[in-house]
């Protein structure tokens, strides 16, 4: 069992993966699907200027299993951070999720 500090370090180090897993979970809920997250293939972030530390749009290309078959998906996740604690995500929203082909 990790300490509270170790859990926080892990959270900060794997943020992109967390967001990708969130995207798959949200898609599964919305579409009543059963995709299983595999890995992040590519990630790009676009931040709002001037408040780039507050809101960020993540463009993720991820691999997920659909009925045992690996496929590629593109997800767009909008993230809002706490302006007083910029490493804390206050709110996240899946804005787009679409298949892009077989992995």
């Amino acid at each position: 069992m990790g300490s509270r500090l170790e859990e926080e370090l892990r959270r900060r180090l794997t943020e992109i993966e967390e967001l990708a897993r969130f995207a798959v979970d949200e898609h599964n809920k919305k579409e009543n699907a059963l995709l299983e997250f595999v890995r992040v293939v590519k990630a790009k972030e676009q931040s709002s200027v001037p408040h780039w530390w507050w809101t960020t749009m993540y463009y993720l290309t991820l691999e997920a299993k659909d009925g045992g078959k690996k496929k590629l998906y593109e997800a767009k996740v909008w993230v809002k951070r706490d302006p007083n604690m910029i490493f804390k995500i206050n709110f996240k929203e899946l804005q787009e999720f679409k298949p892009v082909g077989d992995a």
């Epitope: 990790g2 300490s3 509270r4 500090l5 170790e6 926080e8 370090l9 604690m85």
Partner: nanobody, 122 residues
């Protein structure tokens, strides 16, 4: 109040190596040893992200993109943390910040060094 002083940045070619070091002051060894120490980096126009850290238990943890290339080590008796960066890539170019994370029970508190520039260019 924890103060952090970094050293060791510079200009290097792709595939090269650099070693960053950081020493903490203004805090007792026992207090610091209850905190995590590590490194963040910030590329131009991007958010500051954690790269590697050593927990208060001595466990080293890494961001996926640097795993196998970077090695973080912590000297608990001398209040130091180092980052050995090997097989550097252009995308590793950033200002690297020494970082200490304290668990204050109700929240986490971050302490920062002033930053050291690492530039990877052909």
């Amino acid at each position: 109040e924890v103060q952090l002083q970094e050293s060791g940045g510079g200009l290097v070619q792709p595939g090269g190596s650099l070693r960053l070091s950081c020493t903490a002051s203004g805090v007792t060894i026992s207090a610091l040893n209850a905190m995590a120490m590590g490194w963040y980096r910030q590329a131009p126009g991007e958010r500051r992200v954690m790269v590697a850290a050593v927990s208060e238990r001595g466990n080293a943890m890494y961001r996926e993109s640097v795993q196998g290339r970077f090695t973080v080590t912590r000297d608990f008796t001398n209040k130091m943390v180092s980052l050995q960066m090997d097989n550097l890539k252009p995308e590793d170019t950033a200002v690297y910040y020494c970082h200490v994370l304290e668990d204050r029970v109700d929240s986490f508190h971050d302490y920062w060094g002033q930053g050291t520039q690492v530039t990877v260019v052909q």
